[in-house]
């Protein structure tokens, strides 16, 4: 009966037809599973835990970019629920490759101690 | 008297899209969903899928994901189907259709006149 | 999909006889809950189609006594006892017991 259901949806047995999983706010992630004609009883969302976050839809919570730990950079703005967190300039001590195009994460700074000669970040 | 008017003909070229209506008057078009279904000329019926008017939700038939996209006005009573990348295999009337669901009896009870699109450069 | 199968494809017929179209689904269409939702339309000429039977024996408001609807499972009949001329045009039979719902090729009722 509901072996054409989609990805994100459930079969009503109310209209006998697939339906739209609900889908999950900004900050919030799915509990539990729903999709290709079946839905859990308690399916429904829950807020992202500490240092994650959701656009919404039925995407699961990511943790947010570790802006000093892994890019070794600072922080722009800190992640929230709703939002990535943003990084700005390398930290001290560290240098980005110019023309060097963006990984998946963004900018990646390397340390100075790698520098070619008069680099400026890590100048004096 | 429960009706679903269309919008006119459409002549339309190919790799175009056009966008259709259907306004719905005389029940509560939030309390049905409105379904879409295509007749190629001379042929059979085919399910495009529906909308719930009163949340937007949407189910499309699997062939026609990315072809066709279903959506509704409430203040106006209108629901609408877009179909894009057009060619000459979506030349059909398109008809709107409600959907009766009321005590476990599934089945389509009023049928707007349907929409004529012909896709030709 | 199911896939439903009617026969004849066409039907000349004469006024006031009786007229039979068979429609086939390719799976059985009782539901979980037991229903059977086998239905039947009418595509008058130059007409959108219209309900006459629904869940395989009900005749929808207004629809004459004449028409009437049986079978189960995967085998469904549709008679009328005594053909009028505006009972003419194109016979659908379709299901919505499976998602998505589909339709028979259609039976085209026309005078001999």
């Known amino acids: 009966e509901y072996s054409n259901c989609g990805e994100n949806e459930y079969y009503n047995q109310t209209t006998g037809l697939c339906q739209e999983c609900p889908p999950c706010g900004p900050g919030e992630e799915p509990y539990l599973s729903c999709g290709y004609g079946t839905k859990d009883e308690d399916y429904g969302c829950v807020p992202c835990p500490a240092e994650k976050f959701s656009k919404g839809g039925y995407q699961i919570c990511r943790r947010h970019k570790d802006c000093e730990g892994f890019f070794r950079a600072t922080v722009l703005t800190p992640g929230d629920m709703e939002n990535d967190a943003e990084c700005g300039p390398c930290l001290p001590g560290y240098y980005m490759l110019e023309n060097r195009p963006r990984n998946i994460y963004g900018m990646v700074c390397y340390s100075c101690l790698l520098a070619p000669p008069n680099t400026k970040e890590c100048v004096g | 008297e429960v009706q679903l008017k269309k919008s006119g003909p459409e002549l339309v070229k190919p790799g175009a899209s056009v966008k259709m209506s259907c306004k719905a008057s005389?029940?509560?078009?939030?309390?049905?969903?409105m379904h879409w279904v295509k007749q190629s000329h001379g042929k059979s019926l085919e399910w495009i899928g529906y909308?719930?008017?009163?949340?937007?939700?949407?189910s499309n038939n699997q062939r026609f994901k990315g072809k066709a996209t279903l959506t509704a006005d409430k203040s106006s009573s209108t629901a609408y189907i877009q179909l894009n990348s057009l060619t000459s295999e979506d030349s059909a009337f398109y008809y709107c259709?409600?959907?009766?669901?009321?005590?476990?009896?599934?089945?389509?009870?009023?049928w707007g006149a349907g929409t004529t699109v012909t896709v030709s450069s | 999909d199911i896939v439903m199968t009617q026969s004849p494809l066409s039907l000349p017929v004469s006024l006031g006889d009786q007229a039979s179209i068979s429609c086939r689904s390719s799976q059985s269409l009782v539901h979980s809950n037991g229903n059977t939702y086998l239905h039947w339309y009418l595509q008058k000429p130059g007409q959108s189609p219209n309900l006459l039977i629904y869940?395989?024996?009900n005749r929808f408001s207004g629809v004459p006594d004449r028409f009437s609807g049986s079978g189960s499972g995967t085998d469904f009949t549709l008679k009328i006892s005594r053909v009028e001329a505006e009972d003419l045009g194109v016979y659908f039979c379709s299901q919505n017991t499976h998602v998505p719902p589909t339709f028979g090729a259609g039976t085209k009722l026309e005078l001999k």
């Open positions: 005389g029940y509560s078009f939030t309390g049905y969903n």
């Open positions: 259709v409600r959907y009766y669901y009321g005590d476990y009896h599934w089945y389509f009870d009023v």
């Open positions: 869940k395989v024996s």
């Open positions: 909308i719930d008017p009163y949340n937007g939700a949407t």
